[in-house]
């Protein structure tokens, strides 16, 4: 019989229910914004905003300082007081909409939903390894601001994204705000603007450049700004907005907006549609060509990538890539495919596509019917004409006006749908060694740290653990401080090591020592841990073999048994070739001689499942006793594998040596032509791996085998005669003298 070891699912080598406790801070209210600061002299801080309060934490997440940012009109509001005697506007709570660092000063800038969305600047004061906030400066000059023109009105209650860029001695705030008719009518925030911070920090310089959704579209056309970042010569905003000004406003898609970071101008404002799809390897009938679209961006982060992912994306190591988590719609509800997909857009490629789009619009030959787009910001026009004009005048350049690039940038899910039901709500990507890791927060309050790699059909987890017991969604914004990431969930901020929270979720030595080097995992006798967790027995260089099962569970005391051992860490080499003298198997007192691997039986094992098999021939010693005993596998002197060498012993109970006994055979005669159904009765007749009933030396074909009974069909007889009948188990004869009589047919 050809018995095969059962597959062990890959998931059995890890346990994602292992509890990890990471440092946390309770903010006393829903966390609205968070940003980190690392100074030149080893000082660092975490700034956490909740309604009406701004917390300053040390690198250990202990509170250093707390500032009242509201309610507006309340005498205790410390930021409001910086604007001098009030009233400055209607009283009300302050929800922090913007929390950014101005690295030039350095200073923290916070802008809230109260006081017309004005901002406050807090200089940073290092105190040892901690940082304190200096008193806030009110970035608002009353005499410069009117409801219809307010350079100091920055934050929209509907959401604002800000990226600060240093140009010369000045700080420029690249601001993108969500608007509706009501917000637009109140102190006129703009959709996209570039504002210069005045040198004396009394506000922003008037006369700034801006784009805004035109009044006629404000009711139906809303733009959500999901993320903003600065890399190279540009600032980028990522938006979710209606695909068309004229069609169904609920049909959304994702765009990237690009602005110059070197010139505070909006003439070279460009937009590009980002298209992310799930394209399963085997397309279902009726599934869309090119994959299922996931048009709505949920979270995004840009980061340089490691060597492996760079190769897969056909870019150079260390190049910046924009990663986005996309869902099928605003509610992110279940569709046919996974709930969340992750797409990667190399920044250089984005820029090339944008530049090519500008060429198409502005260079001869003119493509007829090519629209400039952005009709929600500007008057409609065809390329190469400026907005609202029929033709280019000699002194205007086609390139000096905002443009929507006519082609989109399409990518497919890096994870091949493997995120399945997981709803990702936060994303931060880091490069560790040559590995690119996505650190993801989820709707149910978990952190997934997964290697970003395209070519696999399973996820390579660094970790997958629950942040706490609340199960509240992890919030969109993630910050890095040293070797840690800060995630917010509910009213808590959690500090998660980028190397993962620990190693205890790896259950086997092999899985433990195959973990990424940066995780610092080692084997501690019977668990996976970091060196500080078990200094005594911690090691990273070898694993003992692990027996999980064997077959058969019994064998004859006399005669041989072909024993198949199942488990892991037998070989470390896919071929399963065993160097001479490295593997020693004993069953009880008896040796089991290793058998060469039958190459015809080698079958590819997908990494998602794993099992190793080892076969040996068991010949019991004369001194071996009947009864239960252990199977022991000892591996020594094995050459090291890629991650570790195999060394040690594994013992498994449950093998029994038995003595087969033949009690009865019937019938004792049959026709010479053969085919008589013989029944042999006895005990322990099924032990071992081989048995044979011989009638006059010729095998009687076994039809059924059980512990107490064998059925076989007699072979044809040469003549009418009484012939010897014997039973062999494991090649050894079972005691007893039996005959079978061939008669005439």
């Amino acid at each position: 019989e050809d018995w095969q070891c059962p597959r062990t699912p890959y998931a059995a080598s890890r346990d994602f229910d292992v509890k990890y406790v990471v440092p946390s801070f309770s903010a006393g209210g829903l966390v609205q914004a968070m940003v980190t600061y690392e100074g030149d002299r080893n000082e660092s801080a975490v700034f956490v905003a909740i309604r009406n309060r701004l917390h300053v934490l040390g690198p250990d997440l202990k509170s250093v300082q707390s500032l009242a940012t509201g309610p507006a009109g309340d005498p205790g509001c410390q930021t409001c007081a910086a604007c001098g005697p009030g009233p400055h506007g209607p009283p009300g709570d302050t929800d922090t909409k913007v929390l950014v660092l101005d690295p030039a000063l350095p200073a923290l800038v916070s802008c809230g939903s109260s006081l017309q969305g004005r901002c406050f600047l807090h200089d940073l004061e290092p105190q040892g390894t901690a940082v304190h906030l200096a008193a806030p400066a009110c970035l608002f000059s009353a005499h410069h601001n009117r409801p219809d023109d307010c350079p100091d009105c920055v934050a929209s209650p509907l959401g604002t994204r800000v990226t600060v860029v240093e140009q010369g001695q000045a700080s420029y705030f690249y601001v993108a705000s969500s608007l509706d008719a009501a917000v637009a009518a109140s102190f006129s925030p703009r959709s996209v603007s570039i504002r210069r911070l005045k040198a004396d920090a009394s506000g922003f310089a008037p006369g700034f450049v801006a784009l805004s959704v035109l009044p006629k579209h404000l009711v139906s056309y809303s733009i959500e700004y999901v993320h903003s970042f600065h890399t190279g010569a540009f600032v980028y905003f990522l938006t979710v907005q209606p695909a068309s000004v004229t069609d169904d406003p609920s049909a959304l898609h994702t765009r990237l907006a690009r602005l110059s970071a070197t010139e505070p101008e909006l003439g070279d404002y460009r937009e590009l549609v980002l298209d992310c799809r799930f394209a399963p390897k085997r397309r279902r009938r009726g599934a869309p060509e090119g994959g299922q679209p996931y048009p709505v961006l949920r979270v995004a982060h840009s980061a340089p990538v490691g060597a492996q992912l760079a190769t897969e994306l056909s870019i150079a190591e260390g190049q910046e890539v924009l990663f986005g988590v996309f869902v099928t719609g605003k509610d992110g509800g279940p569709g046919v495919g996974p709930n969340s997909v992750v797409c990667a857009f190399p920044i250089d490629l984005l820029d090339t596509l944008i530049d090519e789009g500008v060429e198409r619009c502005c260079e001869s030959p003119v493509h007829p019917g090519l629209r400039r787009g952005l009709d929600f910001f500007q008057s409609p026009s065809f390329c190469p004409n400026p907005p609202g004009l029929e033709a280019l005048s000699p002194n205007t350049s086609c390139r000096h006006f905002p443009l929507l690039v006519s082609s989109s940038f399409s990518r497919v899910d890096l994870f091949n749908g493997l995120l399945g039901p997981v709803q990702v709500t936060a994303l931060y990507v880091t490069r560790l060694d040559n590995v690119t890791v996505a650190h993801m927060g989820t709707m149910d309050g978990r952190i997934l740290q997964v290697e970003l790699v395209r070519s696999l059909n399973y996820l390579l987890y660094v970790s997958n653990f629950s942040l706490g017991d609340s199960g509240q969604p992890v919030q969109r914004d993630v910050s890095r401080l040293g070797d840690h990431l800060l995630f917010a969930s509910g009213d808590q901020v959690f500090q998660v090591p980028i190397q993962g929270p620990g190693c205890r979720h790896f259950l086997t030595c092999g899985r433990c020592l195959r973990a990424w080097h940066f995780m610092g995992c080692g084997w501690c006798g019977n668990m996976c841990g970091q060196q500080k967790e078990c200094p005594g027995s911690w090691q990273q260089d070898h694993c003992p073999p692990k027996l999980t099962e064997f077959h058969p569970h019994s064998g004859p005391l006399r005669g041989s048994t072909r024993l198949t051992l199942c488990g892991s860490n037998f070989y470390l080499h896919p071929s399963g070739l065993v160097p001479e003298g490295t593997h020693q198997v004993t069953v009880g007192q008896s040796p089991c001689r290793p058998l060469p691997k039958d190459s015809s039986k080698l079958r590819p094992v997908p990494r998602k499942d794993f099992v190793e098999e080892f076969e040996c021939e068991l010949e019991p010693l004369g001194t071996q006793a009947v009864g239960p005993t252990n199977v022991s596998l000892t591996v020594t002197n094995m050459p090291p594998g890629k991650h570790f060498r195999v060394d040690g012993t594994s013992v498994l109970r449950g093998f029994s040596f038995m003595e087969p006994v033949l009690i009865a055979v019937q019938p004792l005669f049959g026709p010479r032509a053969g085919g008589t159904c013989l029944t042999l009765e006895g005990q322990s007749l099924s032990v071992g791996t081989s048995r044979a009933v011989l009638v006059n030396g010729t095998e009687c074909l076994l039809a059924r085998v059980s512990e107490g009974q064998l059925l076989c069909a007699t072979p044809p007889g040469a003549t009418v005669a009484s012939v010897p009948l014997s039973l062999q188990v494991g090649g050894a004869q079972v005691p007893g003298s039996w005959t079978f009589q061939y008669r005439e047919d």
């Epitope: 410390q78 007081a81 910086a82 604007c83 001098g84 005697p85 009030g86 000063l105 600047l121 200089d123 200096a134 008193a135 806030p136 400066a137 040198a199 004396d200 920090a201 009394s202």
Partner: antibody, heavy 121, light 107 residues
Framework: EVQLVESGGGLVQPGGSLRLSCAAS????????MSWVRQAPGKGLEWVSE????????NYTPSLKERFTISRDNAKNSLYLQMNSLRAEDTAVYYC??????????????WGQGTTVTVSS | DIVLTQSQKIVSTSVGARVSVTCKAS??????LVWYQQKPGQSPKTLIY???FRYSGVPDRFTGSGSGTDFTLTISNVQSEDLADYFC?????????FGAGTKLELK
């Protein structure tokens, strides 16, 4: 380390003039508002004048505006106070002071040791 | 002009005690108030600005509080080196104005 060193004080007759100087070092002078503050013998402090980094914004205490002129030379890291038509009540120690950072309008964080002006006949 | 009144001309205290110095503004100055310490023959030193923010390097036994028109400088656990004149100054309106000062002396 921030250092402000005043000079130019001395004895002057009523109606006379003096020009006080303040040499700054240890910080980016061109980014800070600077002030003059005086203290009459045995009395409290009195703010005199201030000037913004690019000399475009200048403020005085109203009673001194006609007689005193504040100026600065960022290239030389220097602050000046030109005092004309001096009176006996202008007798005081004159301090040069730097504003707290670049944006807290009138809070001073660094002061010179002062230079004494005596107006007497 | 905004008048700042420091009603206590002299406050007597002992080492280790807790003492408060007050300053009252003739009109609302928000939190735009600074406290200075001046020892005889020396120039003033900034202690607290924006009413409650301790200037860097100032010991944490100095605490500022108040907003609007009423402000207090509190020194807990007074040390002998704290004996000096204390001035408040508002910077909410021009001209910038100072209080007349409060002298802290040993009983």
């Amino acid at each position: 380390e921030v250092q402000l060193v005043e000079s130019g004080g001395g004895l002057v007759q009523p109606g006379g003039s003096l020009r006080l100087s303040c040499a700054a070092s240890g910080f980016d002078f061109s980014r800070h508002w600077m002030s003059w503050v005086r203290q009459a013998p045995g009395k409290g402090l009195e703010w005199v004048s201030e000037i913004n980094p690019d000399s475009r914004t200048i403020n005085y205490t109203p009673s001194l505006k006609e007689r005193f002129t504040i100026s600065r030379d960022n290239a030389k890291n220097s602050l000046y106070l030109q005092m004309n038509s001096l009176r006996a009540e202008d007798t005081a120690v004159y301090y040069c002071a730097r504003r707290v950072r670049i944006h807290y309008y009138g809070a001073m964080d660094s002061w010179g040791q002062g230079t004494t002006v005596t107006v007497s006949s | 002009d905004i008048v700042l009144t420091q009603s206590q001309k002299i406050v007597s205290t002992s080492v280790g005690a807790r003492v408060s110095v007050t300053c009252k503004a003739s009109q609302n100055v928000g939190s735009s108030l600074v406290w200075y310490q001046q020892k005889p023959g020396q120039s003033p030193k900034t202690l607290i600005y924006s009413a409650s923010f301790r200037y860097s390097g100032v010991p944490d036994r100095f605490t500022g509080s108040g907003s609007g028109t009423d402000f207090t400088l509190t020194i807990s656990n007074v040390q002998s080196e704290d004996l000096a004149d204390y001035f408040c100054q508002q910077y909410n309106n021009y001209p910038l104005t100072f209080g007349a000062g409060t002298k802290l002396e040993l009983k």
